[in-house]
């Protein structure tokens, strides 16, 4: 019996087609992805093949103005239209709190939303009962397939799930649910989840009875043969893991942003054992036409977005200096504003020992593309912010050693004075440079704001200590020459859309007046 698994992950509100780098589509003839194009390909495969499942491994939420405006209603609507068979909860599904998950998505989705390792407690338990589930048995053709869901146990540090959801260890939580499926005589089981490729591989190795793992979170691109676009494969598709009980378990992921549709064909014997597995992600490029009815629906939903982008978010009573003449040479107040917003967006998990889990921000000055003039009645709109942050990136959470941070700050000024983009703007950091010294030895003082303290204060950076830092995904991926971050980071979790972070902060503050205050000397 042959099953075709179509899968997406980390779509991050890319409902419309995008450019090759998943930013805003400029030249339509070279654009990719989007739900209208995805629908064309999915329908084509459904018509051609008998036993097809369309699965999503989480993080549909967060990433473009679509999510900012529609807050998840767009996800439910278009996933329903595409007839997804199941979805696993990702960490970003909790970005607007549990209510922001329940109302727009859980109550509106016509497909099961799964996670076996999230347990509700207290008053939330009855409110959320039945709205997400540990597993679902899906009839496919005349057979049944069990889908068990899982979500990153780091979600409380990455999003806003509140205090009434407990995120358990994935493997510990999955095993009893898989065992339950076996007692229901379900012998073909897919683990669908959002914990990253390393955890996906562990699940394949450790959870008895899981036949296939369909993952997300790490934006992993797997491919067999010559890759069709810019993404470099992290391994073959499917990636085969030998389980502890000796089975060959295929593990797949489909990069991110709806650029590819994962396509995996699995052959099972009559006892539900995987005989063979093969496939590849399908690049959703312009050779695949956009479905006209879905496209028309997208255009209808788009109208509200255009109206939103010109509405006032808040006011500034000072000039927001985002000029390259400032931000690439010295501390600029636009950099301070953005970094403050980045930290504010990550305020969570205070306890008796920590006032917050992260206090530091770094931001390449070259990523700040425009100032905002306060003389326009002080009004700040989404449109204004899109000019400041036009790249559609995210502000991510990484863990780095102090020594890596020191290297990053040396890189920041290694060729100072040439108006290059690597000059770092900061938050929760005080740095002093001596530009008379030779490159690589210019950082003379680097103090960082404590987190394990009741009264935050600045302490000297410790080389061997591990620090959490918020930064643009561009830097996490080694952009602007920050190769040391990419090479030496100990953990990387993707965060929220950059413009959304700043717009939320401005809306919250209502009136802003960021200063240049001696963070960089």
């Amino acid at each position: 019996w042959e099953l075709t698994i179509l899968h997406t992950n980390d779509v991050h509100s890319r409902l419309e087609q995008t450019s090759e780098d998943s930013s805003k589509c400029v030249n339509a003839s070279r654009c990719m992805g989007g739900v209208a194009r995805l629908f064309t390909k999915v329908q084509q495969i459904r018509r051609a093949e008998p036993n097809v499942l369309l699965l999503d491994a989480g993080d549909q939420y967060q990433g473009t103005i679509w999510f900012t405006v529609y807050k998840g209603a767009e996800v439910a609507h278009f996933m329903n239209a595409l007839r997804y068979d199941a979805m696993a909860l990702g960490n970003h599904e909790f970005d607007n709190g549990v209510e922001g998950l329940i109302e727009p998505l859980l109550k509106e989705a016509k497909f099961p939303i799964l996670s076996a390792n999230i347990k509700a407690k207290g008053p939330l338990a009855s409110q959320i009962s039945g709205l997400y589930l540990p597993y679902k048995v899906l009839p496919v053709g005349d057979e049944v397939v069990g889908i068990v869901g899982y979500t990153s146990k780091e979600t409380p540090f990455l999003s806003n799930p509140g205090t009434n959801l407990v995120f358990e260890d994935e493997i510990t939580a999955l095993q009893p649910e898989v065992d339950k499926l076996k007692t229901l005589n379900v012998n073909k089981i897919i683990a669908l989840g959002h914990s990253g490729f390393e955890t996906d591989k562990l699940i394949a190795q450790k959870v008895r009875g899981v036949d296939v793992v369909v993952g997300g979170h790490s934006n992993t691109f797997l491919y067999t043969g010559n890759p069709p676009s810019k993404e470099v494969p992290a391994g073959k598709y499917p990636f085969i893991v030998t389980s502890d009980d000796g089975r060959k378990v295929p593990v797949v992921q489909a990069y991110a942003f709806g650029k590819y549709l994962g396509y995996l064909k699995i052959e099972f014997d009559e006892r539900g054992n995987v005989i063979s597995s093969h496939g590849n992600p399908i690049l959703l490029n312009s050779s695949i036409p956009e479905d006209p009815s879905i496209k028309a629906d997208i255009n209808k939903w788009r109208i509200k977005l255009d109206n939103y982008s010109t509405q006032e978010l808040g006011k500034t009573i000072v000039y927001l200096d985002g000029s390259s003449q400032s931000c690439r040479f010295r501390e600029c107040n636009m950099g301070n504003l953005i970094c403050d917003a980045m930290i504010n967006n990550n305020l969570r998990h205070a306890d008796e020992m920590f006032w917050n889990h992260v206090s530091m921000c770094i931001l390449n000055g070259g990523g700040i593309r425009s100032p905002i003039d306060e003389r326009n009645n002080g009004t700040i709109t989404w449109e204004n912010l899109a000019a400041v942050l036009p790249f559609g990136g995210t502000f991510d959470l990484v863990q780095l050693k102090g020594s890596t941070l020191k290297k990053a700050f040396e890189h920041s000024v290694h060729r100072y004075g040439q108006s290059t983009g690597e000059f770092l703007q900061v938050g929760g950091i005080h740095v002093v440079y001596d530009l008379s010294r030779k490159p690589g030895d210019r950082v003379v003082k680097l103090d960082v704001l404590c987190t394990k303290c009741r009264v935050p204060s600045y302490d000297p950076l410790k080389m061997d200590e591990i620090y959490k830092v918020i930064l643009p995904n561009f830097l996490a991926n080694g952009g602007d020459g920050f190769q040391m971050i990419k090479d030496e980071l100990l953990r990387h979790d993707s965060g929220d859309q950059d413009i959304n972070v700043v717009s939320t902060y401005i809306s919250k503050m209502k009136v802003i007046y960021p200063a240049v205050e001696g963070r960089i000397k």
Epitope: K110, S129, G130, L133, P134, P139, V144
Partner: antibody
């Protein structure tokens, strides 16, 4: 108004065939899975068969497997049950029911009034 | 197939009484359980889905609870219009199976 209207029931001899139809209105038919459920005189409910939105997934009760065939025509907003090799124990009121979702296993939130099938010689 | 055992098979209660019906599955079905009401000569009507969720338009005196193998259906204050037979149904896996039904009458 959401409505399901069954037709095609009647008196039939054992071993013969009958085709039931269900006309749906008031909702987008191809947005939902559909089911047939029956109730023998004075007895409880018995699920007979179900079909997903696209006809890609189909299920049958063991008691009718190989004899009954469920199908749907989304263009005509219609559900069908082809019943072959009928037996006396197939005598029942047959209800057409809409699933809560487009998948096949959620529960039935809209029911027709039923059509009576009597299998007797 | 999963067997669903409902009890009692019938009960008689007064208007305003709290009525409880139980349903036991032959194996763990998590919370994939629905409750239906069938009035004499009528089609069944969905009241509760996924063990505890009230279907839109259903009065709040009806409620459901339980998970795993043991489930409970409650009418907090019995009304004359609640005279009917109530069925539980598992929706965890095909074939769907129903309980034998509980006939509720007014004393």
């Amino acid at each position: 108004e959401v409505q399901l209207v069954e037709s095609g029931g009647g008196l039939v001899q054992p071993g013969r065939s009958l085709r039931l139809s269900c006309a749906a209105s008031g909702f987008t038919f191809d947005d939902y899975a559909m089911h047939w459920v029956r109730q023998a005189p004075g007895k409880g409910l018995e699920w007979v068969s179900g079909i997903s939105w696209s006809s890609g997934s189909i299920g049958y009760a063991d008691s009718v497997k190989g004899r009954f065939t469920i199908s749907r025509d989304n263009a005509k907003n219609s559900l069908y049950l082809q019943m072959n090799s009928l037996r006396a124990e197939d005598t029942a009121v047959y209800y057409c029911a809409k699933d809560r979702r487009y998948g096949l296993t959620y529960g039935m939130d809209v029911w027709g009034q039923g059509t009576t099938v009597t299998v007797s010689s | 197939d999963i067997q669903m055992t409902q009890s009692p098979s019938s009960l008689s209660a007064s208007v305003g009484d709290r009525v409880t019906i139980t349903c036991q599955a032959s194996q763990d079905i998590t919370n994939y359980l629905n409750w239906y009401q069938q009035k004499p000569g009528k089609a069944p009507k969905l009241l509760i889905y996924d063990a505890s969720n009230l279907e839109t338009g259903v009065p709040s005196r009806f409620s459901g609870s339980g998970s795993g193998t043991d489930f409970t259906f409650t009418i907090s204050s019995l009304q004359p219009e609640d005279i009917a037979t109530y069925y539980c149904q598992q929706s965890v896996v095909l074939p769907f199976t129903f309980g034998g039904g509980t006939k509720v009458e007014i004393k």
